[in-house]
Amino acid sequence: APISSHCRLDKSNFQQPYITNRTFMLAKEASLADNNTDVRLIGEKLFHGVSMSERCYLMKQVLNFTLEEVLFPQSDRFQPYMQEVVPFLARLSNRLSTCHIEGDDLHIQRNVQKLKDTVKKLGESGEIKAIGELDLLFMSLRNACI
């Protein structure tokens, strides 16, 4: 089971209208550049077999991957939203740095790895897709971690 006290974010993180709006605007703009509507990153396959109490830890993994492998490399695109949203998400990642789960997390890593593999396989269009799903990342973090 997760160490719940560390796998939590204060709901105030998700109640800031300005940065919430900027996150959704960034997702919307990137989605307009995403021509691959058949592939889903954040959805039922990601959560399959993961209990509700493990999902904040799961989303921490997705958030860290998205920051390091997608947002940082694409940081010059989708301005001015990117320069505001990346620091916000980085702060959330930092606040989840002590979020771990005890015991076997293989099933979680397997699901996250599938998402990573999909993004990598699609190359730059996979990165654009991940940015286009930042609204879902935001909602998933909020639903799982508050």
């Epitope: 995403d34 889903r40 954040i42 959805g43 959560f47 909602m139 998933s140 639903n143 508050i146």
Partner: antibody, heavy 119, light 108 residues
């Protein structure tokens, strides 16, 4: 098999409250959000909100804020929706439905509970 | 604000193909789901994520997307397909699911 079974029909007076139950079976209750959706006679579907059975956390549609309360009892795998200060236009069939992520399709629905508000 | 637009009714002869559309502004990164509701019954999910079919739903039911329009296609229509059909997306900007107004499918 996976199912959601709701409580029976209710008749209420304006100003009263109603509490509808939704009993889950055939899956791990805590792993799916329970949503409430209502349908007025001859009308479309209207989302009211969800409860996270694991944490008890809720998210309500703005229209129902302050009037709706969604709860759950983990020990009996049951979710509840209470609507207060009932008006005649609250007459509807109330459905519970489950979803995996909080923003995914509703893959299983309860059979519905007719709530009639009449003086 | 987002609105999903469906035709109020569609009529089709048995054995033919029925197409029900769902239009919305800014559909692009939203997943479209379709529900069938027969009179006096609860809705049933028939298509999710634009084109995926839940187990138990006949292959005659399919979904597709083109730009800002999603389409539910029912091939070789049967009398038992007569029902109301609703499209749905999750609107992240308002953080709630949006339902179309519903389409009544009549089998002639």
């Amino acid at each position: 098999q996976v199912q959601l079974v709701q409580s029976g029909a209710e008749v209420k007076k304006p100003g009263a409250s109603v509490k509808v139950s939704c009993k889950a079976s055939g899956y791990t209750f805590s792993d799916y959000y329970i949503h409430w959706v209502r349908q007025a006679p001859g009308q479309g579907l209207e989302w009211m909100g969800w409860v996270n059975p694991d944490t008890g956390g809720t998210r309500y549609a703005q229209k129902f804020q302050g009037r709706v309360t969604m709860t759950r009892d983990m020990s009996i795998s049951t979710a509840y929706m209470e609507l207060s200060r009932l008006r005649s236009d609250d007459t509807a069939v109330y459905y519970c439905a489950r979803d995996l992520t909080g923003f995914d399709p509703f893959d299983i629905w309860g059979q519905g509970t007719l709530v009639t508000v009449s003086s | 604000s987002s609105v999903l637009t469906q035709p109020p009714s569609v009529s089709v002869a048995p054995g033919k193909t029925a197409r029900i559309t769902c239009g919305g502004n800014n559909f692009r990164n939203k997943r479209v789901h379709w529900y069938q509701q027969k009179p006096g019954q609860a809705p049933v999910l028939v298509i999710y994520y634009d084109s995926d079919r839940p187990s138990g739903i006949p292959e005659r039911f399919s979904g597709s997307r083109s730009g800002n329009t999603a389409t539910l296609t029912i091939s070789r229509v049967e009398a038992g397909d007569e029902a109301d059909y609703y499209c749905q997306v999750w609107d992240s900007s308002t953080d709630r699911p949006l339902f179309g107004g519903g389409t009544k499918l009549t089998v002639l």
